[in-house]
Amino acid sequence: AVNGTSQFTCFYNSRANISCVWSQDGALQDTSCQVHAWPDRRRWNQTCELLPVSQASWACNLILGAPDSQKLTTVDIVTLRVLCREGVRWRVMAIQDFKPFENLRLMAPISLQVVHVETHRCNISWEISQASHYFERHLEFEARTLSPGHTWEEAPLLTLKQKQEWICLETLTPDTQYEFQVRVKPLQGEFTTWSPWSQPLAFRTKPAALGKDT
């Protein structure tokens, strides 16, 4: 049952959520499957029901506690298993011993807001959500700005190599509509990846004053 054609990937949001995706070619569509979490040094177990996200891929979120509670530490190892029902029993389809702080993906930054906007500049701030206090200041950010007539994929990435929850965008065009997104990544963890992009923040630069270039 546990074989190489199965891919089982999970990330920890650093607080109280482990999100998992399991994909397997030829897996039964109408079988009930779940992810089971068994920490090595905790008294709790947790399960979540895998729900289809595509033809051969399923996902679920293990909710370990209140969103801001610190449920796991850097020394924890969690045995994660994909279990699929066969009759009255559950077959192990995939298994991994998961080091949470080696497999981090934080929640997208929230509360984006325009602090100050001018004709050519805009100062934007944001907050990180459900991020562990263990990181202290060991976080980095990427930001991108959507200009008129372009796509997000074409937007150049701005890198902030420190925990800086604001940015001053410069060389903007007056009286122009823009959108802005940011994402976050801890410096810790061999398999750590970027958070999802934040919800876009729309803003408009101020029009240039007549006869002036501000």
Epitope: V2, R81, R89, W90, R91, V92, I95, D97
Partner: nanobody
Framework: QVQLAESGGGLVQPGGSLTLSCVAS????????MAWYRQAPGKMRELVAS???????VYADSVKGRFTLSRDNTKNTVYLQMNSLKPEDTAVYRC???????????WGQGTQVTVSS
């Protein structure tokens, strides 16, 4: 019902070595994962090292580079080679096997490892 029997524990000086063995009464190829756990008095149980049926090995950070996990499928045995032992490695070491089914969790009785001068 799979039986697990550990051996190889004992008293060793700091910096010394031991090899623990875990022999299964059934085929370890039918196990989804084999692992060694340890528990020191008054401490929480912790996973030391594990190997899945597809060969993925994980080590606790505290033993990485000092301990080596291996298996011999023909002998249905899993080994834990422990080098550069430290007093904090003192614990009861227990072998664990997880089967093909969710209700198949097997434990050995454990073997005592004491690191002391």
């Amino acid at each position: 019902q799979v039986q697990l029997a550990e051996s190889g524990g004992g008293l060793v000086q700091p910096g010394g070595s031991l090899t623990l063995s875990c022999v299964a009464s059934g085929s370890i190829l039918e196990m989804s994962r084999m692992a060694w756990y340890r528990q020191a008095p008054g401490k929480m149980r912790e996973l030391v090292a594990s190997i899945t049926s597809i060969g993925s090995i994980v080590y606790a950070d505290s033993v990485k580079g000092r301990f080596t996990l291996s298996r011999d499928n023909t002998k249905n045995t899993v080994y834990l080679q422990m080098n550069s032992l430290k007093p904090e490695d003192t614990a009861v070491y227990r072998c664990n096997a997880l089967g093909t089914w969710s209700d198949e969790t097997y434990w050995g009785q454990g073997t005592q490892v004491t690191v002391s001068s």
